[in-house]
Amino acid sequence: EVEKTACPSGKKAREIDESLIFYKKWELEACVDAALLATQMDRVNAIPFTYEQLDVLKHKLDELYPQGYPESVIQHLGYLFLKMSPEDIRKWNVTSLETLKALLEVNKGHEMSPQVATLIDRFVKGRGQLDKDTLDTLTAFYPGYLCSLSPEELSSVPPSSIWAVRPQDLDTCDPRQLDVLYPKARLAFQNMNGSEYFVKIQSFLGGAPTEDLKALSQQNVSMDLATFMKLRTDAVLPLTVAEVQKLLGPHVEGLKAEERHRPVRDWILRQRQDDLDTLGLGLQG
């Protein structure tokens, strides 16, 4: 807490500029008007303030806005955002995607901090759902963002937002998350033709039920083994040898290399040996 002291003569700040970097902490406290700071927040980022000086500026804004900063200030926080605590951020009402982008830019290249997580949570709750533009923005900054959400949170993602999802955004999703995302993806891509559909739905197939895998086998998709290995075991088990053969196409030979790993291992054990033999791969049930 900075002590309240009078501003020395001639030091009263008329604007936020580089001269302030030479002010001691107590001088900043005494000589910079909080309202002036709020209106000229966009200049703060251009000035190489020390962390201690930024603490003082934050303190001034906290005093001016005890109920939480207005969006006009939040949008221009820049590096001052790094000084905010999750408790500070919970008081904010961020509605503009531009504001969100500006703050995410500050944290770019770092792991998602508790502050960023709180900011995103506030923003999404304010919007009511995770719309396409928001998802686009979030996954651009944090490819693993989608997989950090709980299945309950993912349920608020509208199917239209799924178009923004890239394969790498789903790399760390677990089966429970894909169970929620897959039906949305199926709905989002339903009007695409066979081959285009498969390209789009492929990353989500870890949430696909048996019936949909059987249906995919009718579309000449030639699923690769890497995708097949990510399918739900309970969805793969009821597939017949002929269906797996049609689903994998020329990649069916790859089953041999994966015969000891799930879901291939469990699927093999469920098949009749006579049926497995027709693949000519030497698979033993």
Epitope: P209, T210, E211, D212, K214, A215, S217, Q218, N220, P238, T240, V241, A242, E243, V244, Q245, K246, G249, P250, T278
Partner: antibody
Framework: EVQLVESGGGLVQPGGSLRLSCAAS????????MSWVRQAPGKGLEWVAT????????YYPDSVKGRFTISRDNSKNTLYLQMNSLRAEDTAVYYC??????????WGQGTLVTVSS | DIQMTQSPSSLSASVGDRVTITCRAS??????LNWYQQKPGKAPKLLIY???RLHSGVPSRFSGSGSGTDFTLTISSLQPEDFATYYC?????????FGQGTKVEIK
């Protein structure tokens, strides 16, 4: 032993409707896609419709699309084919067949549908 | 749609003969080619699937070969119960289509 028994065939006027049924036994019906294949008198085989194991997906050739509807009731182990706007060229023996990936592996004995005025 | 053309349309043969039926697809169907046998007044029965795999219970005198667009069904030694009509069917691409059939008659 896989058994498929069709019923519901008969004589119907052009423009009329008919519903065929196929009772399945000897296998887990809800695990398999099912199909209808027809054969006009003295002619070859023509695939008519296929339905996914849960009933979500249906497939038809252009010749019957919009007129025929395949459906199933897994609780009754029964497959159906609703045929509307029937034409003389729909006259055929209609076979119910189990469909496995790309193979019609088991067939019923067929039911004759005659479309004539 | 993929057209399936069988030849010959019919053939006459004697018991013990080696019989060959061919089936040509209008485009590449990989190995998704099946053969069915149908006797008069009866339902078709699956004989061979995926070009050369024998369905359960089918005698080993039946065999299949080919890939891409050209396929063959061979009966190594014709038996009395083999006189029937044989159909090929492609399972590569919807709509699934059948050949027009080859009738094997007694000479």
């Amino acid at each position: 032993e896989v058994q498929l028994v069709e019923s519901g065939g008969g004589l119907v006027q052009p423009g009329g409707s008919l519903r065929l049924s196929c009772a399945a036994s000897g296998f887990t019906f809800s695990d398999y896609f099912m199909s209808w294949v027809r054969q006009a008198p003295g002619k070859g085989l023509e695939w008519v419709a296929t339905i996914s194991n849960g009933g979500t997906y249906t497939y038809y050739p252009d010749s019957v699309k919009g007129r025929f509807t395949i459906s199933r009731d897994n609780s009754k182990n029964t497959l159906y084919l609703q045929m509307n706007s029937l034409r003389a060229e729909d006259t055929a023996v209609y076979y119910c067949a189990r469909f496995d990936g790309y193979i019609f592996d088991y067939w019923g004995q067929g039911t004759l549908v005659t479309v004539s005025s | 749609d993929i057209q399936m053309t069988q030849s010959p349309s019919s053939l006459s043969a004697s018991v013990g003969d080696r019989v060959t039926i061919t089936c040509r697809a209008s485009q590449d169907i990989s190995s998704y080619l099946n053969w069915y046998q149908q006797k008069p007044g009866k339902a078709p029965k699956l004989l061979i699937y995926y070009t050369s795999r024998l369905h359960s219970g089918v005698p080993s005198r039946f065999s299949g070969s080919g890939s891409g667009t050209d396929f063959t069904l061979t009966i190594s030694s014709l038996q009395p119960e083999d006189f029937a009509t044989y159909y090929c069917q492609q399972g590569n691409t919807l709509p699934y289509t059948f050949g027009q059939g080859t009738k094997v008659e007694i000479k």
